[in-house]
């Protein structure tokens, strides 16, 4: 997974929204204790911004040491800074914790760019604005890192919420959420509402701002509008899903749907951008360029290098298209679509040199590791990671940024055939899965 602008085929699969509506499966499940309703103590427990990650306050050790921890659905280790680092305000001091237990084992996590390494142990962990429980969890105490911590991000560690298969050093290291569910009565589900500000935040504003909510063990109805639509988790490693169709302003990209998921498609709160496989990225940019051709943007804008600016308050949102991703539904031959606005994929950036203008960075980028639905996508939606039922739910977020003419949307059902063929089967090798 990546926090900055980080971290073989079949043809013609229809997937057209034929206007044909399938009989509606009840996507609202019957009430279950602990799974539904209000989670007031957890609402607004995230801070941060899409460019540098969203973090939750956690405590580790006895007496408790408070740290801000990046919420990352694209990895599976709970890892915290445990030694001085120029970008850290504070770090976990194991020697001060009476409940720390050393596992006498090291861990090394390389990324394509950068790495972190540390020492494994366990300690007592709780989330002050989360469920009222304390769990003994595995902790990687980071002693050395490169291109991992971000200057000014205000977080000191990472909470990997994905599955054990991608945990380091191997899948025997139980991830935090597994420990939480095993040791408590917290249901095996969490949900995320990431709230993009829609305008740039300076450091003091970020510290004061609300970034969203991580609801542990349930779903809070106040955080979304409309219905929740669910897509199956294809395989429990990353939160892998299957995209069956992509549209730009309603125009199908008309690619073999395997391309959209080459070599996988994941939902990753630890990545800033919507990242697309090379061929898909090129087709999407071509289509977005064509739709917004009333203005000529520099090549560097599409690369994420150049900002584009407009006089304050005059951003021409209407010239930019909406982007729809169709996801495999829970019912055979049924899909649904999630639609994001330019308010999600143009990321506001503050630059003193151009402070009189509203400036933006293009937050869709190329990937060599498949589609990554990062904060750009997640900021439009309330996303339910229903691990118990092996599915991910999407509903329109109550905090998404939009204008008077268009809003993000989650709509369905649509008839889509042969969706299973859209998944790419990664050849099994011994290669690291985390080398993203």
């Amino acid at each position: 997974t990546q926090h900055g602008i980080r971290l073989p085929l079949r043809s013609g699969l229809g997937g057209a929204p034929l206007g044909l509506r399938l009989p509606r499966e009840t996507d609202e499940e019957p009430e279950e204790p602990g799974r539904r309703g209000s989670f007031v103590e957890m609402v607004d427990n995230l801070r941060g911004k899409s460019g540098q990650g969203y973090y939750v306050e956690m405590t580790v050790g006895s007496p408790p040491q408070t740290l801000n921890i990046l919420v990352d659905t694209g990895s599976s280790n709970f890892a915290v800074g445990a030694a001085p680092h120029p970008f850290l305000h504070r770090y976990y001091q194991r020697q001060l914790s009476s409940t720390y237990r050393d596992l006498r084992k090291g861990v090394y996590v390389p990324y394509t760019q950068g790495k972190w390494e540390g020492e494994l142990g366990t300690d007592l962990v709780s989330i002050p604005h989360g469920p009222n429980v304390t769990v003994r969890a595995n902790i990687a105490a980071i002693t050395e890192s490169d291109k991992f911590f971000i200057n000014g991000s205000n977080w000191e560690g990472i909470l990997g919420l994905a599955y054990a298969e991608i945990a380091r050093p191997d899948d025997s290291l139980e991830p935090f959420f597994d420990s939480l569910v095993k040791q408590t009565h917290v249901p095996n589900l969490f949900s995320l509402q990431l709230c993009g500000a829609g305008f740039p935040l300076n450091q003091s504003e970020v510290l004061a701002s609300v970034g969203g909510s991580m609801i542990i063990g349930g779903i809070d109805h106040s955080l979304y509008t409309g219905s929740l639509w669910y897509t199956p988790i294809r395989r429990e490693w990353y939160y892998e899903v299957i995209i069956v169709r992509v549209e730009i302003n309603g125009q199908d990209l008309k690619m073999d749907c395997k391309e959209y998921n080459y070599d996988k498609s994941i939902v990753d709160s630890g990545t800033t951008n919507l990242r697309l496989p090379k061929k898909v990225f090129e087709a999407a940019v071509k289509s977005i360029k064509a739709a917004s051709s009333t203005e000529k943007f520099p090549d560097g804008f599409w690369l994420g290098e150049q900002l584009v600016c407009w006089q304050a308050g005059t951003t021409p949102w209407n010239i930019f298209p909406v982007i729809s991703l169709y996801l495999m539904g829970e019912v055979t031959n049924q899909s649904f679509r999630i639609t994001i606005l330019p308010q999600q994929y143009l990321r506001p950036v503050e630059d003193v040199a151009t402070s009189q203008d509203d400036c933006y960075k293009f937050a869709i980028s190329q990937s060599s590791t498949g589609t990554v639905m990062g904060a750009v996508i997640m900021e439009g939606f309330y996303v339910v990671f229903d691990r118990a039922r092996k599915r991910i739910g999407f509903a329109v977020s109550a905090c998404h940024v939009h204008d008077e003419f268009r809003t993000a949307a989650v709509e369905g059902p649509f008839v889509t055939l042969d969706m299973e063929d859209c998944g790419y089967n990664i050849p099994q090798t011994d290669e690291s899965t985390l080398m993203t």
């Epitope: 000529k296 290098e305 584009v308 040199a353």
Partner: antibody
């Protein structure tokens, strides 16, 4: 306040190499590409290339391929440019400049003099 | 590569005058042009981006205009500190290219 502090002047022999540095402060280093620009005495400006500190992605001017190598060290928020096989044609002031809209921030420049 | 041509290497003007420095691109660059001012021995100072937007802190006597291939930097009420060199730059496509520069001199 955004600042780009470049290393001091260099007097180097033909055929050798030199590594220039540009230390950034006042912004999140990973968020912006860093560019390098050449200016020969009394002449115009030439764009050498740029690097994305978040993932080391590089875009070079073909003219400087094999001459300039761009790198970064994110832990010290520093960009580097190494120039190899130096000749008198490489005698110039070299600037680092940060992305934004065009190039809104420039370092003070490093004078490289290639002389036997 | 896109060629940026500043046809006048030197321009004569007087303090208080209005002067226009021109720049021509060899192909359409939209409005993706910047202007820089350079005092001898110093680094370029950004003045204008997106053809006509002033960077923060740039005096309003500097005005940029143009789109496509023809661009102009106009300095009204020229001050003595403006008698330096001005460069245009296109950032529409890679490699980024600069004009050869225009030096303002006293008449």
């Amino acid at each position: 306040e955004v600042q780009l502090q470049q290393s001091g002047a260099e007097l180097v022999r033909p055929g050798t190499s030199v590594k220039l540095s540009c230390k950034a402060s006042g912004y999140t280093f990973n968020n912006y590409w860093m560019h390098w620009v050449k200016q020969r005495p009394g002449q115009g400006l030439e764009w050498i290339g740029m690097i994305d500190p978040s993932d080391d992605d590089i875009k070079n001017n073909q003219k400087f391929k094999g001459k300039a190598t761009l790198t970064v060290d994110t832990s010290s928020s520093t960009a580097y440019m190494q120039l190899i096989s130096l000749t008198s044609e490489d005698s110039a002031v070299y600037y680092c400049a940060r992305s934004g809209v065009a190039l809104p921030y420039w370092g003070q420049g490093t004078l490289v003099t290639v002389s036997a | 590569d896109i060629l940026m041509t500043q046809s006048q290497k030197f321009m004569s003007t007087s303090v208080g005058d209005r002067v226009s420095v021109t720049c021509k691109a060899s192909q359409n660059v939209g409005r993706n042009v910047a202007w820089y001012q350079q005092i001898s021995g110093q680094s370029p100072k950004p003045l204008i981006y997106s053809a006509s937007h002033r960077y923060s802190g740039v005096p309003d006597r500097f005005t940029g205009s143009g789109s496509g291939t023809d661009f102009t930097l106009t300095i009204s009420n020229v001050q003595s500190e403006d008698l330096v060199e001005f460069f245009c730059q296109q950032y529409n496509s890679y490699p980024y290219t600069f004009g050869g520069g225009t030096k303002l001199e006293i008449k």
